[in-house]
């Protein structure tokens, strides 16, 4: 499996996309900030056995499609440009999914493969209620929006590291 | 590693310009906010204002709001600050540091060296 | 605009010596209060974050409480290299906002 450079273009292409689609200076925002508890450890990529880095990766975007695919990310944020990064996203799952199907033929996957994907959904589990617990406010979304760039930038470096290593 | 490095001190004449940059290196640029905080002689610290280098929304403290312009060029990854008139109030030492926005991290964890601005006749 | 003041101005102490200064906040800032060490000609040096959160790399006998208004800075044994003047800030919301500093001198 080869994660090629247009998946990587894919990638930029998402945070960019997630730049655009800010709404309000978030600088109005400041004492919203809430700490989600990045699960970091499952996008260090040391330890990982590459198939699980990439069921992590694939979880990682599907958890994101799933958070701005709701009937109250569809009222946040401009139409348009949501449209263009879920075709982003999908299109990633897609490559990912190949990969996954690719590796497992190769190397088992362990068990603890469900644990870093059970973090992973815990992650975002928190990020859903935190958006509850704030109303879906503008500045919550702002705030949402900037955690979901950075968790997709370690995303990236992962991926950055899988490809050196093929 | 990461770094925030300064320009160098300036001695001015009041009502000329000036333009001090900050630039920094070691970490993704346009991932943190640059602030610019003054440090008159003997005195405490102000804050003046913030840039996101992403875009380059900007805001300022109400005292620094007309006085100063921050700016930054993401493709450099540097941040400025700049006076179109300096006056001898303007004597200070100006620190940049970066910030993380409205991701929860440290604030301020990198700070650059300073730059001695001197402004006299 | 929040107004913070810290007190102490100035306090003279000896090494070893248990340290607390403290930040008052003109309004509820929450827990976005951070502690900044400037020493002469230096830059400052960020301690806490987020009221308690110790900065890496940043000693444990510096500590960090409180929430609402009313914060602490300890240092729990004074040392030579913590004779500096330190800063408290508030990032709650813009202008972000500092104490006018609390300088620490040898007694």
């Known amino acids: 499996c080869n994660l090629s450079q247009t998946h990587s273009l894919n990638n930029r292409r998402t945070l960019m996309l997630m730049a655009q689609m800010r709404r309000i200076s978030p600088f109005s925002c400041l004492k919203d900030r809430h700490d989600f508890e990045f699960p970091q450890e499952e996008f260090d990529g040391n330890q990982f056995q590459k198939a699980q880095a990439i069921s992590v990766l694939h979880e990682m975007m599907q958890q994101t499609f799933n958070l701005f695919s709701t009937k109250n990310s569809s009222a946040a944020w401009d139409e348009t440009l949501l449209e263009k990064f879920y075709i982003e996203l999908f299109q990633q799952m897609n490559d990912l999914e190949a990969c996954v199907i690719q590796e497992v033929g190769v190397e088992e996957t362990p068990l603890m493969n469900e644990d870093s994907i059970l973090a992973v959904k815990k992650y975002f589990q928190r990020i859903t209620l935190y958006l509850m617990e704030k109303k879906y406010s503008p500045c919550a979304w702002e705030v949402v929006r900037a955690e979901i760039m950075r968790s997709l930038s370690f995303s990236t470096n992962l991926q950055k590291r899988l490809r050196r290593k093929d | 590693e990461v770094q925030l490095v300064q320009s160098g001190a300036e001695v001015k004449k009041p009502g000329e310009s000036l333009k001090i940059s900050c630039k920094g290196s070691g970490y993704s640029f346009t991932s943190y906010w640059i602030g610019w905080v003054r440090q008159m002689p003997g005195k405490g610290l102000e804050w003046m204002g913030i840039?996101?280098?992403?875009?380059?929304?900007?805001r300022y403290s109400p005292s620094f709001q007309g006085q100063v312009t921050i700016s930054a060029d993401k493709s450099i990854s540097t941040a400025y600050l700049q006076w179109s008139s300096l006056k001898a109030s303007d004597t200070a030492m100006y620190y940049c540091?970066?910030?993380?926005?409205?991701?929860?991290?440290?604030?301020?964890?990198?700070w650059g060296q300073g730059t001695l601005v001197t402004v006299s006749s | 605009d929040i107004q913070m003041t810290q007190s102490p101005s100035s306090l003279s102490a000896s090494v070893g010596d248990r340290v607390t200064i403290t930040c008052r906040a003109s309004q509820s800032i929450s827990s976005y209060l951070n502690w900044y060490q400037q020493k002469p000609g230096k830059a400052p040096k960020l301690l806490i974050y987020?009221?308690?959160s110790l900065q890496s790399g940043v000693p444990s006998r510096f500590s960090g409480s409180g929430s609402g208004t009313d914060f602490t800075l300890t240092i729990s044994s004074l040392q030579p290299e913590d004779f500096a003047t330190y800063y408290c800030q508030q990032s709650y919301s813009t202008p972000l906002t500092f104490g006018q500093g609390t300088k620490v001198e040898i007694k």
């Open positions: 987020a009221a308690s």
């Open positions: 840039i996101d280098p992403s875009d380059s929304d900007t």
């Open positions: 540091a970066r910030h993380p926005g409205l991701n929860w991290a440290p604030d301020f964890d990198y």
